[in-house]
Interface confidence: low
C-alpha cells in the first residue's frame, strides 16, 4: 500500500466494445502518461498489473486470468478478452510497479449489445466523403493486432442492415470499402464484420462508422456575403432599433474555421462606446455547406451611430471578404401645416 502516482480515471478513453467479440485494450500509461514504452519498463524490471472495478461497485479487484479458454489474458501491455461478456463492463486499472516505483491509471470499459442490424449505444466515428469527387474509401477501423498477417479474415460490409453486394457505386475490397463516386444517398452507417479463426474458434469483429457526404473541394469557393448587399438600405430615425443581418455562405472545407465578424468604424464592436449586441445563428446544408448569420443590433440608435461605417467580414480557408451595410438617417416626413403649405405658396 505504498504511495503510487495515480493518474485517476482517464475518461477521455471511454472504451466501448461489443458483447461476445474479442477486444484488445492497451494500457493507457504508455500512450498518454509516461515517457517510456512497455519494453523499456519491462527491461527495467517493472511489472504491469491489472485490476478492475465492476460496474456499480467501488472495490478494485485483480482480474481473473484463469478463466476457461483463457477468456481474459494479458500480453505485454495489452489486456485481451476472447470474447467479452456483458458483465465485463467496469473501470479497469493498469499499474506499473517495482519496489521503488509505482504508477497507475484507470479507464472505463463498456461492453455494449448490438441488434441484428448493428444498432447499439456505441458512439460512431464519422468519415466524411466528398460529393462526386471520384474514388474514395473507408477502411474497417481498429482491427490491427487481432490476428497475425498469416491469417486471412473474411470481411463483410453492410450499409445499415443490408449486405453490400452488387451496389452500383460501392465496392467492398477487403478491409476497404470503395465509393466509386459518392452521392448524398451514400450517407448512413456502414459496418464491417471481420471474421477470423483462432485456436479452433471463430471470432467476429464488428466495426460501424457513419459516412457523411460533404461538399467537394472542387466546388469550394471563398465566403459569399448575401447580406448586407447593395439592394438594401438601412434607413432609421434616431431612437429606433437598428438591426443589420450579416448572412454568409461558406462552402464545406475539411478542417476549415469559418469566421464572421462585424466592424464599426473599423473597430470591433466591443471597442466602440455604444450598446451593440450581436446574435449568431448557423445552419447547414445536406453537404455541410454552412450559412452563418450575425445580426448586429443597436436598441436605440443615435444620429451619430447612423453616420458610422458598419462592415461585415467573413473568412474561411478559401479567403476573406467584407461588405459594408448602407446605413442612413431617415429624412423626417414634412409636416403639412408648415413645410407643405409653404411649398404650395399658401399665405
Amino acid at each position: 500500500s505504498e504511495r503510487c502516482d495515480d493518474w485517476g480515471l482517464d475518461t477521455m478513453r471511454q472504451i466501448q466494445v461489443f458483447e461476445d467479440e474479442p477486444a484488445r485494450i492497451k494500457c493507457p500509461l504508455f500512450e498518454h502518461f509516461l515517457k517510456f514504452n512497455y519494453s523499456t519498463a519491462h527491461s527495467a524490471g517493472l511489472t504491469l498489473i491489472w485490476y478492475w472495478t465492476r460496474q456499480d461497485r467501488d472495490l478494485e479487484e485483480p482480474i481473473n486470468f484463469r478463466l476457461p479458454e483463457n477468456r481474459i489474458s494479458k500480453e505485454k501491455d495489452v489486456l485481451w478478452f476472447r470474447p467479452t461478456l456483458l458483465n465485463d463492463t467496469g473501470n479497469y486499472t493498469c499499474m506499473l510497479r517495482n519496489t521503488t516505483y509505482c504508477s497507475k491509471v484507470a479507464f472505463p470499459l463498456e461492453v455494449v449489445q448490438k441488434d441484428s442490424c448493428f444498432n447499439s449505444p456505441m458512439k460512431l466515428p464519422v468519415h466524411k466523403l466528398y460529393i462526386e469527387y471520384g474514388i474514395q474509401r473507408i477502411t474497417c477501423p481498429n482491427v490491427d493486432g487481432y490476428f497475425p498477417s498469416s491469417v486471412k479474415p473474411t470481411i463483410t460490409w453492410y450499409m445499415g442492415c443490408y449486405k453490400i453486394q452488387n451496389f452500383n457505386n460501392v465496392i467492398p475490397e477487403g478491409m476497404n470499402l470503395s465509393f466509386l463516386i459518392a452521392f448524398i444517398s451514400n450517407n448512413g452507417n456502414y459496418t464491417c464484420v471481420v471474421t477470423y479463426p483462432e485456436n479452433g474458434r471463430t471470432f467476429h469483429l464488428t466495426r460501424t462508422l457513419t459516412v457523411k457526404v460533404v461538399g467537394s473541394p472542387k466546388n469550394a469557393v471563398p465566403p459569399v456575403i448575401h447580406s448586407p448587399n447593395d439592394h438594401v438600405v438601412y434607413e432609421k430615425e434616431p431612437g429606433e432599433e437598428l438591426l443589420i443581418p450579416c448572412t454568409v455562405y461558406f462552402s464545406f472545407l475539411m478542417d476549415s474555421r469559418n469566421e464572421v465578424w462585424w466592424t464599426i468604424d473599423g473597430k470591433k464592436p466591443d471597442d466602440i462606446p455604444i450598446d451593440v449586441t450581436i446574435n449568431e445563428s448557423i445552419s447547414h446544408s445536406r453537404t455541410e455547406d454552412e450559412t452563418r448569420t450575425q445580426i448586429l443590433s443597436i436598441k436605440k440608435v443615435t444620429s451619430e451611430d447612423l453616420k458610422r461605417s458598419y462592415v461585415c467580414h467573413a473568412r474561411s480557408a478559401k479567403g476573406e471578404v467584407a461588405k459594408a451595410a448602407t446605413v442612413k438617417q431617415k429624412v423626417p416626413a414634412p409636416r403639412y401645416t408648415v413645410e407643405l403649405a409653404c411649398g404650395f405658396g399658401a399665405t
Epitope: I135, I155, N166, N168, P172, E173, M175
Partner: antibody, heavy 121, light 107 residues
Framework: EVQLVQSGAEVKKPGESLKISCKGS????????IGWVRQMPGKGLEWMGI????????RYSPSFQGQVTISADKSISTAYLQWSSLKASDTAMYYC??????????????WGQGTLVTVSS | EIVLTQSPGTLSLSPGERATLSCRAS??????LNWYQQKPGKAPKLLIY???SLQSGVPSRFSGSGSGTDFTLTINSLQPEDFATYYC?????????FGQGTKVEIK
C-alpha cells in the same frame, strides 16, 4: 463453367470504327464487373476500364477516357469495347476479364481468349 | 494512379530452382495485390489474390507474400510449364494498374 468468349480477330484501316464483344456464360453476368485490358505487341498489360453490366456503370482509366467506349447488353450477357476512329497505335490484343469483387478481395479471375485488332493502311 | 514496379525484368533460372519475383507499389495498397501468369499467345491466368491467397487449381509451389508496398511471388522448384511472364496488379483503387511484368526464362 465460367467462360468469357470474345469475338474474332479484326483487321481495320485507320479512321474506321470497330466494336468487339465479350460474352459471359456459366455465372450471373450482371453480378460481376467486366474489365478490358490492352496488350500491345511485345508489351505488358494495361487496364482500360470496367463496366458493371447490371446498370452499365463504367469506369475508365485516364489513359483511355474518351478514346474508347465500354458498354454492355445484359439481355445477352455481352460486354463491348468500341472505337469510333481507329489509329495504327490501337493495334493490340484486347482481353476482357471478369472482376471478382468478393467480400475481401478483388481480382480478374476469368479471362477471355483475347481479340487481336490490327489497324493498318 | 498507383504505379507498380516489378523486378527483375527478366529472371534466368533452371528447372528445379526457386524464383523470387518482386513487386513494389508507389503507395500502400494494403493486401490488395494479385499475381497473374501469362504464356505467349495466351490470356493471363490468376495465380495469387489478396497478396497471399492461392487461386483454386494453382499448384502449391506458387506462393505470395507482402503487404503495404512490397510484395513477393515465390515459385518453389520451377517446372518447365512455369517459364512465362508474371504480372502483379493492384485492386486497391481505380484505375487498376499492372506492373510491367517479369519474364522467367530457362537458363
Amino acid at each position: 463453367e465460367v467462360q468469357l468468349v470474345q469475338s474474332g480477330a479484326e483487321v481495320k484501316k485507320p479512321g474506321e470504327s470497330l466494336k468487339i464483344s465479350c460474352k459471359g456464360s456459366g455465372y450471373s453476368f450482371t453480378s460481376y464487373w467486366i474489365g478490358w485490358v490492352r496488350q500491345m505487341p511485345g508489351k505488358g498489360l494495361e487496364w482500360m476500364g470496367i463496366i458493371y453490366p447490371s446498370d452499365s456503370y463504367t469506369r475508365y482509366s485516364p489513359s483511355f477516357q474518351g478514346q474508347v467506349t465500354i458498354s454492355a447488353d445484359k439481355s445477352i450477357s455481352t460486354a463491348y469495347l468500341q472505337w469510333s476512329s481507329l489509329k495504327a497505335s490501337d493495334t493490340a490484343m484486347y482481353y476482357c476479364a471478369r472482376r471478382n469483387s468478393a467480400e475481401n478481395y478483388a481480382d480478374l479471375d476469368y479471362w477471355g481468349q483475347g481479340t487481336l485488332v490490327t489497324v493498318s493502311s | 494512379e498507383i504505379v507498380l514496379t516489378q523486378s527483375p525484368g527478366t529472371l534466368s533460372l533452371s528447372p528445379g530452382e526457386r524464383a523470387t519475383l518482386s513487386c513494389r507499389a508507389s503507395q500502400s495498397i494494403s493486401n490488395d495485390l494479385n499475381w497473374y501468369q501469362q504464356k505467349p499467345g495466351k490470356a493471363p491466368k490468376l495465380l495469387i489474390y489478396y497478396a497471399s491467397s492461392l487461386q483454386s487449381g494453382v499448384p502449391s509451389r506458387f506462393s505470395g507474400s507482402g503487404s503495404g508496398t512490397d510484395f513477393t511471388l515465390t515459385i518453389n522448384s520451377l517446372q518447365p510449364e512455369d517459364f512465362a511472364t508474371y504480372y502483379c496488379q493492384q485492386s486497391f483503387t481505380a484505375p487498376l494498374t499492372f506492373g510491367q511484368g517479369t519474364k522467367v526464362e530457362i537458363k
